[in-house]
Amino acid sequence: ESGYAQNGDLEDAELDDYSFSCYSQLEVNGSQHSLTCAFEDPDVNTTNLEFEICGALVEVKCLNFRKLQEIYFIETKKFLLIGKSNICVKVGEKSLTCKKIDLTTIVKPEAPFDLSVIYREGANDFVVTFNTSHLQKKYVKVLMHDVAYRQEKDENKWTHVNLSSTKLTLLQRKLQPAAMYEIKVRSIPDHYFKGFWSEWSPSYYFRTPEINNSSGEMD
């Protein structure tokens, strides 16, 4: 006979897979940091399940997460950002699974914004610029950016360019003439912090000039 049959919810809970992943966002709201966790399995029954972080906190021993639909979330100034914290999934006072995590190694930057492309006729190139909120931050200032662009008709044929600045020049001769292009950008911590790619910026669309038949140049 199964040892799980007598005591309802708690024993049933121990049969489930409660593996989870988290990411931090530093100085996401002024000097406030955030931590977001979610279960790997979207079908986990999250009723009565809570997340708690303990250790490497300022002035408190532990903090509880707020639940927002299927994610668990904290926004606070109380992350020490030095050393490891223990993040646990709990039901009541019982911990079902825990992870030791240094919050500076799971940083997900904010998505870049204000992406734009300007065509320079004299230079025969396109200047790509974008902005990032991280230029103003105390901690996660150094990012690697991934600019991805494609001809709109090529569904999955993205060209990627990695750069550390927020400006990129695309040569006109490397692009198809009279074509519509989609371009987007994302960021990842590069020095002093580790973590994950940000969400993609909103896409920007631009059209390349036609070829001028007399010279073989694009208009």
Epitope: G83, D102, T104
Partner: nanobody, 118 residues
Framework: EVQLVESGGGLVQAGGSLRLSCESS????????MGWFRQAPGKGLEWLAA????????HYSDSVKGRFTISRDNAKNTVYLQMNSLRSEDTGRYYC???????????WGQGTQVTVSS
């Protein structure tokens, strides 16, 4: 077996400077937080400064803020404490600690003595 070794202590006049070093033989040094503590004669252990694995994040106690600077060199497995404007009350044994894991420092050195004379 020795895992954390402090050096750089000594006798210094008030107002002077010293630089303490702590070399680690722990394999996870470059991903571990590091800290400095001291124990003054007849007193308990006092936390002074801490630094994250990359050196990007540092914290100081009010008693040393603005006078002491913690830094690290992950290529040399070493953490430093630069101590300026030393005072007689800074006298004590200085210890480094490694791997701040859920509010507990996992490894400790044997300490180095600092004496500030007035």
């Amino acid at each position: 077996e020795v895992q954390l070794v402090e050096s750089g202590g000594g006798l210094v006049q008030a107002g002077g400077s010293l630089r303490l070093s702590c070399e680690s033989s722990i394999s996870t040094f470059s991903s571990d937080a590091m800290g400095w503590f001291r124990q003054a004669p007849g007193k308990g252990l006092e936390w002074l400064a801490a630094i994250g694995w990359s050196g990007a994040v540092t914290h100081y106690s009010d008693s040393v803020k603005g006078r002491f600077t913690i830094s690290r060199d992950n290529a040399k497995n070493t953490v430093y404490l630069q101590m300026n404007s030393l005072r007689s009350e800074d006298t004590g044994r200085y210890y480094c600690a490694e791997d701040y894991d859920t509010d507990v420092w996992q490894y400790w050195g044997q300490g180095t003595q600092v004496t500030v004379s007035s």
